[in-house]
């Protein structure tokens, strides 16, 4: 959870209107009872806005009262809005719910940018659109904040879907999801398709839009094309993976392949950018730079402060290079590939001054924390969390936008040696030195 | 310097009233959260009650929840403790004491420096 | 709520002693605990905040160590300046609670 802003990201229409929907491919993998299939009532159940966040409705309490929380992969806490705030249009109040249990600790969460602080208690949690369950979940009622509420988003809360390990105050605070599947039949997985409208929302089409789909316990064969691959998680914490080779239009970044995960790489639906280890960025800027030169762009650009823009509906895709993710795969020397397109990692803004424009963002950035696959990688795929099986599958997004030319893509096999070699050994500090991401 | 000056102590029935005050001044009031701490008479020190930097937060020992209220006019750089149904047990110094940041759970947001107390003596 | 338990009640030591003051708590309380040393008439000072960070002008001669119920402030070679009164305190649970204190007098 990551940039500039880390939590805050983006999302939008469901539909790809300026690109276009793939045909539905045959799934060559084996069925899974109660694991794939349909799961129509969870189809389309997040909306967002870009740059700020993909949010579910979730309800909590007795009476239920209802919130918009932000789904974030890359924290472990699932806390709301519980005092008034100049961003919040409503927030949780403990004091008219009969089933909430006071556990008397206090809690407070740093990001890189933002933070917020809070009191612990439990409560009745569910999903309206999601399974049929209630839970008893760790709340942190969020009494204090800085710069996390974002004004417009239209979310009061986070669910932070990732593991213990990571959870404050520490990692005895167990995260909804353990809840959920402790306390239910709900398989130990969610998938997530995250969908970029392409262009900027306002604030009316963003409530009337779709954003994509959380399906909790199971695969949904509609909102993807092709077959999924699979990464092993490598450590249950945040959700890490493995990159082993990136590759800017075919051309690899020849890196050792360690400076790739250093210090981590992480799948997190909370960040909006692409963001990647400082050589790494440097050596992609200089590549997609390279690959983009008839055209010259500002270094504020390159930076993400910038923005750049065409006359609408002339933006020249074509000039801008896919990259290219190698990922570990579940079978030893074997590797896949995730593709995406300048759709992706091109984030559509509005310019106030020239909105008869197509203005756009670059959504890669630098970090110092490792590589965090935010939305820009996951607008392009359905993402599937299998917790279960300690691995993360990606497939071609039935909703991400592209154009006649050229579509994301997950490929492979692909023999890659020495892919242990990859993943960087973090040193072991003291455990409140671990800053949640955010950026 | 940080200096925090507590006043409005004295003496009070059991049953009454009194509000504390606590006047700031050397620092950024509104960015620190502040607290409240007593010490009965030859006795150790007992936690009262806290409030984050924005007020947004506060919080109270079971002993007085209900009874007191803690508040702050970050406007007049002044943090407050209303005491009502006071009793005989209530007696005390009461001192102030400044948060770290404006958090209350930050790791080293803990409460320094403190007011030299006020005394409240709660007796018929 | 969490209590903390400070032995001994009292310590008494004679200058450039080593003292070792003792806190337990009731319950895990991570490392969300602090020294304060507080002399007769006056208020209070921090010495130690997060179980073993020392504050801002306090001398190397206080260390504290420990985390969850075992926790130990040592002054490691006693100054005519530390006889006081010392308290820890706990904020990771309601109500933050004190312990009931340890004297370190003059032996």
């Known amino acids: 959870t990551q940039h500039g802003i880390r939590l805050p990201l983006r999302s939008g229409l469901g539909g790809a209107p300026l690109g276009l929907r793939l045909p539905r491919e045959t799934d060559e993998e084996p069925e899974e009872p109660g694991r794939r299939g349909s799961f129509v009532e969870m189809v389309d159940n997040l909306r967002g806005k870009s740059g700020q966040g993909y949010y579910v409705e979730m309800t909590v309490g007795s009476p239920p009262q209802t919130l918009n929380i932000l789904v974030d992969t890359g924290s472990s806490n699932f806390a709301v809005g519980a005092a008034p705030h100049p961003f919040l249009h409503r927030y949780y109040q403990r004091q008219l719910s009969s089933t909430y249990r006071d556990l008397r600790k206090g809690v407070y969460v740093p990001y890189t940018q933002g933070k917020w602080e809070g009191e612990l208690g439990t409560d009745l949690v569910s999903i309206p659109h999601g399974p049929n369950v209630t839970v008893r979940a760790n709340i942190a009622a969020i009494t204090e904040s800085d710069k996390f509420f974002i004004n417009g988003s239209n979310w009061e809360g986070i669910l932070g879907l990732a593991y213990a390990e990571i959870a404050r105050p520490d990692d005895s605070l167990e995260p909804f999801f353990d809840s959920l599947v402790k306390q239910t039949h709900v398989p130990n997985l969610f998938s997530l398709q995250l969908c970029g409208a392409g262009f900027p929302l306002n604030q009316s089409e963003v409530l009337a839009s779709v954003g994509g789909s959380m399906i909790i316990g199971g695969i949904d064969h509609s909102l993807y094309t092709g077959s999924l691959w699979y990464t092993p998680i490598r450590r249950e914490w945040y959700y890490e993976v493995i990159i082993v080779r990136v590759e800017i239009n075919g051309q690899d970044l020849k890196m050792d392949c360690k400076e790739y995960n250093y210090d981590k790489s992480i799948v997190d639906s909370g960040t909006t950018n692409l963001r990647l280890p400082k050589k790494v960025f440097e050596a992609a800027v200089k590549s997609i730079k390279a690959a983009s030169s008839t055209e010259k762009f500002p270094d504020g650009f390159w930076l993400g402060e910038q923005l750049v823009c065409w006359q609408a509906g002339t933006t020249p895709w074509n000039i801008f290079p896919v990259i290219s993710l190698y990922l570990m795969g579940e079978v030893t020397n074997q590797s896949f590939r995730i593709t995406i397109l300048p759709q992706q990692y091109l984030r559509p803004v509005e310019d106030v001054a020239t909105s008869q424009d197509d203005c756009y963002k670059f959504a890669i950035s630098q970090s110092s924390t490792g590589t965090v696959m935010g939305a820009v990688i996951m607008e392009g795929f359905y993402v599937v969390f299998d917790r279960a099986r300690k691995r993360i599958g990606f497939a071609v997004s039935a909703c991400h936008v592209h154009d006649e030319f050229r579509t994301a893509a997950v490929e492979g096999p692909f023999v890659t040696l020495d892919m242990e070699d990859c993943g960087y050994n973090i040193p072991q500090t003291d455990e409140s030195t671990l800053m949640t991401g955010r950026a | 310097e940080v200096q925090l000056l507590e006043s409005g102590g004295g003496l009070v029935q059991p049953g009454g009233s009194l509000r504390l005050s606590c006047a700031a001044s050397?620092?950024?009031?509104?960015?620190?959260?502040m607290s409240w701490v007593r010490q009965a008479p030859g006795k150790g020190l007992e936690w009262v009650s806290a409030?984050?930097?924005?007020?947004?937060?506060?919080y109270y020992a079971d002993s007085v929840k209900g009874r007191f209220t803690i508040s702050r006019d970050n406007s007049k750089n002044t943090l407050y403790l209303q005491m009502d149904s006071l009793r005989a047990e209530d007696t005390a110094v009461y001192y102030c004491?400044?948060?770290?940041?404006?958090?209350?759970?930050?790791?080293?947001?803990?409460?320094?420096?403190w007011g030299q107390g006020t005394l409240v003596t709660v007796s018929s | 709520e969490i209590v903390l338990t400070q032995s001994p009640a009292t310590l008494s030591l004679s200058p450039g002693e080593r003292a070792t003051l003792s806190c337990r708590a009731s319950?895990?309380?991570?490392?969300?605990l602090a020294w304060y040393q507080q002399k007769p008439g006056q208020a209070p000072r921090l010495l130690i905040y997060?179980?073993?960070n020392r504050a801002t002008g306090i001398p190397a001669r206080f260390s504290g160590s420990g985390s969850g119920t075992d926790f130990t402030l040592t002054i490691s070679s006693l100054e005519p300046e530390d006889f006081a009164v010392y308290y820890c305190?706990?904020?990771?649970?309601?109500?933050?609670?004190f312990g009931g204190g340890t004297k370190v007098e003059i032996k």
């Open positions: 305190v706990q904020r990771s649970n309601f109500p933050w609670t």
């Open positions: 319950q895990s309380v991570s490392s969300y």
């Open positions: 004491a400044k948060g770290g940041s404006q958090w209350l759970y930050a790791p080293g947001s803990w409460f320094d420096p």
């Open positions: 050397g620092f950024t009031f509104g960015s620190y959260a």
């Open positions: 997060d179980a073993s």
């Open positions: 409030t984050s930097g924005s007020g947004g937060s506060t």
